[in-house]
């Protein structure tokens, strides 16, 4: 339950956070769709992957993503009033050796091939305080979330806590 002013307050803590252990606490395959039920799909084009947000035809199969969940411990804030904060972070891999990355300079979400240990750009803080939807906040750029812009995934700066409920940064996870 960590909205925008909380995110900004935790800028330092997010950057300082370390993934506890190299193993995820859990992993599973799920299809990713937007709040408005458009599917996130991945297509190999010219030896690189493109990410699309689109309506699927009735019997078209949804692409699956491997979600790997990690715990991240960060120091408690400047007030020094006790327990460290435990965050839940996620990496998203639609195909072997490729992971979603935040490109903060271009405000884009890209698929990069890389080996473990994964770079920080591949980690997203998971938010699920909006009923059964989730949001993905960049570990490398607190207050910036994966969102939908012009039928593509993009990085979207969220500047007030109310905007955490904005539909374009909310996603649904489904096993079907």
């Amino acid at each position: 339950a960590f909205g925008i002013s909380g995110v900004q307050k935790y800028t330092r803590a997010l950057h300082d956070s370390s993934i506890t252990g190299i193993s995820p606490i859990t992993e599973y395959l799920a299809s990713l769709s937007t709040y408005n039920d458009q599917s996130i799909t991945f297509a190999l084009e010219d030896e690189s992957y493109e990410i699309y947000v689109e309506d699927l035809k009735k019997d078209e199969k949804k692409d699956k993503v491997l979600l790997s969940y990690y715990e991240s411990q960060h120091p408690s804030n400047e007030s020094g009033d006790g327990v460290d904060g435990k965050m839940l972070m996620v990496t998203l891999s639609p195909t072997k050796d490729f992971w979603l990355h935040a490109n903060n300079k271009e405000h884009s979400v890209e698929l990069h091939k890389c080996e473990k240990p994964l770079p920080d750009q591949a980690f997203f803080v998971l938010h699920n305080m909006h009923s059964n939807c989730v949001s993905f906040e960049c570990k490398t750029d607190p207050g910036v979330f994966i969102g939908v812009k012009d039928n593509h995934l993009a990085l979207i700066k969220v500047d007030s806590s109310e905007n955490l409920c904005t539909e374009n940064i909310l996603f649904k996870l489904s096993e079907t």
């Epitope: 339950a1 909205g3 969940y69 327990v83 435990k86 839940l88 998971l126 305080m129």
Partner: antibody
Framework: QVQLVESGGGVVQPGRSLRLSCAAS????????LHWVRQSPGKGLEWVAL????????YYADSVKGRFTISRDNSKNTLYLQMNSLRPEDTAGYFC???????????????WGQGTLVTVSS | DIQMTQSPSSVSASVGDRVTITCRAS??????LAWYQQKPGKAPNLLIY???SLQSGVPSRFSGSGSGTDFTLTISSLQPEDFATYYC?????????FGPGTKVDIK
Amino acid sequence: QVQLVESGGGVVQPGRSLRLSCAASGFTFSSYGLHWVRQSPGKGLEWVALISYDGSNKYYADSVKGRFTISRDNSKNTLYLQMNSLRPEDTAGYFCAKSLYTTSWYGGFDYWGQGTLVTVSS
Amino acid sequence: DIQMTQSPSSVSASVGDRVTITCRASQGIRSWLAWYQQKPGKAPNLLIYAASSLQSGVPSRFSGSGSGTDFTLTISSLQPEDFATYYCQQANSFPPTFGPGTKVDIK
């Protein structure tokens, strides 16, 4: 260490109101989602309500929707539950609980208060 | 809402016994399941989260397993302080829901 201390319980007649409080210490209060969970005497646990870190998101169990209001005062490190139009079936021990993770309730509730008893009876 | 069921509803065991409690969800909840221990007059205490992660400070004789709809809590060697009621809770879909509890008492 983390402490959550509830207060405000008591005996109340059906249709009346009661306000519960939960005073928190030992963690960064303003960064966590908080919950109310209740337990009827000799029975199991029932989740009642959730409030996000800054109070902008609130969710309720169907059984209390429209009657109960969850709120928080981050300057006082205190969580509240305003209970209106109380019914005999609301009789229970009420616990406040903290989410394990800062941004998610996937991990369950890692710290609980000792509970405060609410009895609704004429 | 997702319904959670537990079995058995109660179990009598002796110190040193291996005790297994099962929890079933009415639909898939991935690995988002927590287990709590509650003693009379006390608040619940988180033992296991994410189906198999041991909460800090909890003895290693407690372990959890499972994913999807079927989950297990195992106490490898029951200790006197383990006699209590155990609840599972799904944390995957809103609203969070609890199982009815399993009471572990002295044989």
